[in-house]
Amino acid sequence: DIIMRPSCAPGWFYHKSNCYGYFRKLRNWSDAELECQSYGNGAHLASILSLKEASTIAEYISGYQRSQPIWIGLHDPQKRQQWQWIDGAMYLYRSWSGKSMGGNKHCAEMSSNNNFLTWSSNECNKRQHFLCKYRP
């Protein structure tokens, strides 16, 4: 049998049953999530659930830039260091950079310091690039 790989929206890239859109415009975390949702298909800020997924995403983004952090779908809505993915995925894989998680930093970004393989927490009202994800 021929199995057709699902297609992603123009400009989005495909990896392991998911489509990803890397948006190079500046949005705060909540506006970024709203923009992801506006694309339909159940899109949200991206959850990153394995090293393989993280590596694929990091390699893709490094082709575009290597200096600006990027919002992902991990946040701490209760502000109690109880992190969760906005798309409801299980928070099992973690890749924090090891920086202090204190202060008013309750949203997660892919850090450019380690080629986007590790995460840092940041203030949610900061405007940054963002990564969306949906399953086609």
Epitope: Y22, F23, R24, K25, L26
Partner: antibody
């Protein structure tokens, strides 16, 4: 259908200012950056700057810093480009263009252009 | 003076292939996958032909292709047709978060 509708031709005197508008329809106004690009008669394209309609943030080409101001009115889905202290070499066709929601980093929708003539 | 360098003109016969180059620096063309190409017919607005160096928007013929090597991007048009006669411009994102254009190349189909 996405449309960028620009204001009509302008004739201005040297030293004056001109304000060109670009009205958006067919997509979420606050979703896309809007850029302004000009083209002098018989010349190439020149990027002037861009505005983020969501927040009003701007980024201008160094050449136009201090002379150009880009603004927006979200209530009527319109962006504006004002160029002050006009000179004869500002005579050009002025285009607004969008960059497709930040995915392409390219200008995939263009207005038809507004002719600005600077003459005494 | 344009930041990106393009040949002023190129020409080719119908059915042939031509390539237009666009040379910048590591701060623009060489530093990013952000090169785009535009076609402009006289009196018309430019039309996006290639984005991110080598990707075609829907509706653009597969006769148009883009590539990049180092600080130079290229647009290739295969199987030239009369309607391809136009001006072509490259553009790139820069390290200052600005955009720059090349000076433009006039394509003549002989």
């Amino acid at each position: 259908e996405v449309q960028l509708v620009q204001s009509g031709a302008e004739v201005e005197k040297p030293g004056a200012s001109v304000k060109v508008s670009c009205k958006v329809s067919g997509y979420t106004f606050t979703g896309d950056y809007m850029h302004w690009v000009r083209q002098a008669p018989g010349q190439g394209l020149e990027w002037m700057g861009r505005i983020d309609p969501k927040y009003g943030d701007t980024n201008y080409a160094q050449k136009f810093q201090g002379r150009v101001t880009m603004t927006r009115d979200t209530s009527i889905s319109t962006v504006y480009m004002e160029l002050s202290r006009l000179r004869s070499d500002d005579t050009a066709l002025y285009f607004c263009a969008t960059d497709n929601s930040g995915l392409y980093d390219a200008f995939d929708k263009w207005g038809k252009g507004t002719t600005v003539t600077v003459s005494s | 003076q344009s930041v990106l360098t393009q040949p002023a003109s190129v020409s080719g016969s119908p059915g042939q292939s031509i390539t237009i180059s666009c040379t910048g620096t590591s701060s623009d063309v060489g530093g990013y996958n952000y090169v785009s190409w535009y076609q402009q017919h006289p009196g018309k607005a430019p039309k996006l032909m290639i984005y991110e160096g080598s990707k075609r928007p829907s509706g653009v013929s597969n006769r148009f292709s883009g590539s990049k090597s180092g600080n130079t991007a290229s647009l290739t048009i295969s199987r030239l047709q009369a309607e391809d006669e136009a001006d072509y411009y490259c553009s790139s994102y820069t390290t200052r978060s600005t955009r720059v254009f090349g000076g433009g190349t006039k394509l003549t189909v002989l």
